[in-house]
């Protein structure tokens, strides 16, 4: 068969063949292979894994597989001068030191190159002073401390518990509060689920376990030294002082054994309420400083990490499209890990590997997708989404013209309860339809669809009989594609029961205990949840690359735009007097949303009725669908965040992981009652409403009949 004939096999048959080829046993085997040694970004081990993946993707049958390298700023602990925190007495003697490395898990005691826990990109420094406990170090926690409790963090070392928000936001907040250092720790209240044993006997965090992670505030910039441009051999690099997003104060993470020793001596103010108290046997006093007997003791940080320009490698595989080779559907996930990466990222990388193998098998049998599929194994995600961002910067002109969709493939699991999907509204119907065709892996749902178990376990808060789909935030490799370039994006993984498990992330996240055994013993022994995630991710890619008409429904965007407009209007209406005084109106925005709704409805009718055998018309309609997400991009970006350009969605300014709708308006309204110049502040709200109105109206017009 020729490739064009092969493409004409009925889509259902192709999709079924693709899905049937995916095997749980292969995912298990790949996960084991990817997790035997650490694959830290910038290391030889991770380069070797890149070459292995390149070679295997070629064997699987992709048309081409290339390594693309960039020289980016990374950060590592000093091997001969370890980072730690001390309690020092009045003579300056260290009477307690935090641990230098995590106790290695059984079977891994002799593995070399396990990077000790550190906060990537922390500057060097040895600040000493009194401790202040700042809860999760969220914006509202500092408001409580500074405004209500009148506690000044200036010149103090703050200790914050991990969870609720991205650690980089915690550090930024501490810096703004005048802190001289930050200690991050995992509290059992957030990282130890009741009734479960700690690793290696269960999936909970042991006392010596520590969460690594970067503490950047890049706001989508990619490599801190080359914002906006690829970090290639001729790139101009900023000096460290001008680098984007680097923290200015030392930061270090610790486990709860060590945290206990610091927190048990805390004096000063009592915690304001129970929401500030974790599960350690300590008073959770806020400070500043230690209590009576220990008041002369101080805390001292010893941070000696270095930042250095280091080479990273992406693997980019191509499966050329038979009909529209200039239209790209991208499946990407990262390869670099903090240590073994048992969940993050290798549970995702193993799924990508099996998806590539399945597509390759079909291709070897003569089939090709309608559109080109690009597969990516990103490097340095843990250091600020660097591999994906640099590649997208290098290929931005192609991507903005040809990018149909991006499907992210980091960790396949963060629990084993139900499906979790975050995506553009354009993909809602695709996800619903696909999950109705897939079998649920959940106990008690044998013979039922994934859609059914997902809806039952994670119902939509707005629409009964439908599952919840969340907004895209950031903290993963879809960021540059969605937030900067406006390429329709989505992600899917299996998650925990958020009702019963209130802890943040999964307990062993970014610790040395995130091993193959963790997954195989406790999360997914049969790899059935991994297989389901492979089917969802792979199925989405298949449909996006192979449907004659792109599986996007613009009417779903209309629905959410109305919801987001209502939400932001309600926030603003908490200040009715000021709205009146400064003539703030949302009428124009609601009008634009109404126009969008009407035009989207008419477009959907035309899409249903047009002659799909007419290649020009088909391409025209598909281009309107493809470019709709692009239409929400403002080339000027959001205030002070030039690389977050999507007007409808952006990562929250207070938590990178969370998505915020109408972020420009939201940020302009945030804490507006405390602004020194209310006239200027409300003027900015009005400016942001006008930008949002224009963008929604302009996007609507891209769906209008062309002539």
């Amino acid at each position: 068969k020729s490739s064009s004939e092969a493409t004409n096999i009925t889509p259902k048959h192709n999709m079924k063949a693709f899905l049937d080829e995916l095997k749980a046993e292969n995912i298990k085997k790949f996960l084991h292979n990817f997790t035997q040694i650490p694959h830290l970004a910038g290391t030889e081990q991770n380069f070797q894994l890149a070459k292995q993946i390149q070679s295997q993707w070629k064997e699987f049958g992709l048309d081409s597989v290339e390594l693309t390298h960039y020289d980016v700023l990374l950060s590592y602990p000093n091997k001969t001068h370890p980072n730690y925190i001390s309690i020092i007495n009045e003579d300056g003697n260290e009477i307690f030191n935090t641990s230098l490395f995590e106790p290695p898990p059984a079977g891994y005691e002799n593995v070399s190159d396990i990077v000790p826990p550190f906060s990537a990109f922390s500057p060097q420094g040895m600040p000493e002073g009194d401790l202040v406990y700042v809860n999760y170090a969220r914006t509202e926690d500092f408001f409580k401390l500074e405004r209500d409790m009148k506690i000044n963090c200036s010149g103090k070392i703050v200790i914050a518990r991990y969870g609720k928000v991205f650690r980089g936001n915690k550090v930024k907040n501490a810096q703004l509060a005048g802190a001289t250092g930050v200690i991050l720790y995992s509290d059992p209240a957030d990282y130890f689920a009741p009734g479960v044993k700690s690793y290696p006997d269960g999936w909970n965090l042991p006392g010596g376990g520590v969460q690594r992670g970067n503490i950047l505030n890049l706001n989508g910039a990619g490599d801190p030294l080359t914002p906006g441009y690829p970090a290639n051999e001729y790139a101009y690099r900023r000096g460290i002082a001008e680098a984007v997003g680097l923290p200015s104060i030392p930061v270090h993470p610790i486990g709860y054994y060590d945290a206990q020793k610091l927190l048990e001596k805390m004096g000063g103010s009592a915690s304001p309420d129970s929401s500030w108290r974790g599960s350690l046997k300590v008073p959770y006093n806020v400070g500043p400083g230690f209590t009576g007997n220990f008041s002369t003791q101080k805390v001292k940080m010893h941070i000696h990490s270095t930042s250095e320009v280091t080479r990273i490698y992406n693997v980019i595989g191509t499966l050329r499209g038979a009909v529209e080779p200039d239209r790209y559907v991208i499946l990407g996930g990262h390869r670099d890990s903090w240590v073994f990466g048992g969940i993050d990222p290798q549970s995702g990388a193993a799924v990508v590997h099996e998806i590539v193998r399945s597509f390759g098998t079909l291709k070897k049998e003569g089939w090709r997708p309608r559109r080109t599929i690009l597969f990516a194994s990103w490097d340095a995600e843990e250091f600020g989404l660097l591999g994906s961002t640099e590649w997208a910067e290098e290929n931005s002109r192609l991507l903005q013209e040809r990018g149909v969709a991006y499907i992210n493939a980091d960790s396949s699991i963060e629990g084993n309860y139900t499906l979790r999907v975050d995506c553009t509204p354009l993909m809602y119907s695709l996800v619903y339809n696909l999950t109705k065709e897939l079998e649920s892996p959940d106990e008690g749902f044998e013979g039922k669809s994934l859609y059914e178990s997902w809806t039952k376990k994670s119902p939509s808060p707005e629409f009964s009989g439908m599952p919840r789909i969340s907004k895209l935030g950031s903290g993963n490799d879809f960021e540059v594609f969605f937030q900067r370039l406006g390429i329709a994006s989505g992600r899917a993984r299996y998650t925990k029961n958020w009702e019963t498990n209130k802890f943040s992330s999964y307990p062993l996240y970014h610790s040395v205990y995130e091993t193959y055994e963790l997954v195989e013993k406790f999360y997914d022994p049969m790899f059935k949840y991994h297989l389901t995630v492979a089917q969802v991710r792979g199925g989405m890619v298949f449909e996006l690359a192979n449907s004659v008409v792109l599986p996007f429904d613009c009417r779903d965007y209309a629905v959410v735009l109305r919801k987001y407009a209502d939400k932001i209007y309600n926030i603003s209406m908490k200040h009715p007097q000021e709205m009146k005084t400064y003539s703030v109106s949302f009428d124009s925005l609601f009008s634009a949303v109404k126009n969008f709704t009407e035009i989207a409805s008419k477009f959907s009718e035309r899409l249903r009725d047009f002659d799909k055998s007419n290649p020009i018309l088909l391409r025209m309609m598909n281009d309107q669908l493809m470019f709709l997400e692009r239409a929400f991009i403002d080339p000027l970006g959001l205030p002070d965040r030039p690389f977050y350009r999507h007007v409808i969605y952006a990562p929250s300014s207070h938590n990178k992981y969370a998505g915020e709708s109408f972020p420009g308006i939201y940020d302009a309204l945030f804490d507006i009652e405390s602004k020194v110049d209310p006239s200027q502040a409300w003027g900015e709200v009005k400016r942001q409403i006008s930008i949002a109105t224009f963008t929604v109206q302009a996007a609507a017009e891209t769906l209008s009949e062309v002539a």
Partner: antibody, heavy 123, light 107 residues
């Protein structure tokens, strides 16, 4: 099987130095805190020093502080006790003992003991 | 520093007797207390940790109790092989001091 073997004991003059070693086998040495305990002839047990699994903390009995130094080499599965400025009252059997597996315990007793090595300080 | 005291310093009891040894800490140590048995000329043996948890392989006639500053070691039915000196030890905070020991023998 789990084993601790002390060595380095002997007769030494007051004021001189001695270095004791404790070779560990049969367990994941790099996960365990390690102690030295001594017992003077006909007397009770006296705790001497402890070192955390990663060497981050070292604590000493007041009687040896400033004279003895505990250390470890995880790559060699060995812990050491450097004893300087020895005194007659340091004469004892010195036991190496395993503390808690830090993967499981922060606080724990000493569950495995070596046979001991005798140190005699005499002129 | 935390001082540990034990009473009695020695005791004699008959086979089958219930024997209780007391250990007191000069300040609260939560339940971070261990008990050891040392027979004459032998290496100490770990009996109990966290004040009341029996180390595996230790006969069930041994039990521990207490919290804070006052602790007990009980042998419910004394056996000839229990003749030894028993030591308590604080491991709440360094220095991890031992008690002076209680010598147990058979009448």
């Amino acid at each position: 099987q789990v084993q601790l073997v002390e060595s380095g004991g002997g007769v030494v003059q007051p004021g001189r130095s001695l270095r004791l070693s404790c070779a560990a086998s049969g367990f994941a040495f790099s996960r365990y805190g390690m102690h030295w305990v001594r017992q003077a002839p006909g007397k009770g047990l006296e705790w001497v020093a402890v070192i955390w699994y990663d060497g981050s903390n070292k604590y000493y009995a007041d009687s040896v502080k400033g004279r003895f130094t505990i250390s470890r080499d995880n790559s060699k599965n060995t812990q050491y006790l450097q004893m300087n400025s020895l005194r007659a009252e340091d004469t004892a059997v010195y036991y190496c003992a395993r503390g808690g597996d830090f993967l499981y315990y922060y606080y724990y007793g000493m569950d495995v003991w070596g046979q001991g090595t005798t140190v005699t300080v005499s002129s | 520093d935390i001082q540990m005291t034990q009473s009695p310093s020695s005791l004699s009891a008959s086979v089958g007797d219930r024997v209780t040894i007391t250990c007191r800490a000069s300040q609260g140590i939560s339940n971070y207390l261990a008990w050891y048995q040392q027979k004459t000329g032998k290496v100490p043996k770990f009996l109990i940790y966290e004040a009341s948890t029996l180390q595996s392989g230790v006969p069930s006639r041994f039990s521990g109790g207490g919290s804070g500053t006052d602790f007990t070691l009980t042998i419910s039915s004394l056996q000839p092989e229990d003749v030894a000196t028993y030591y308590c030890q604080n491991y709440n905070s360094a220095p991890f001091t031992f008690g002076p020991g209680t010598k147990v023998d058979i009448k």
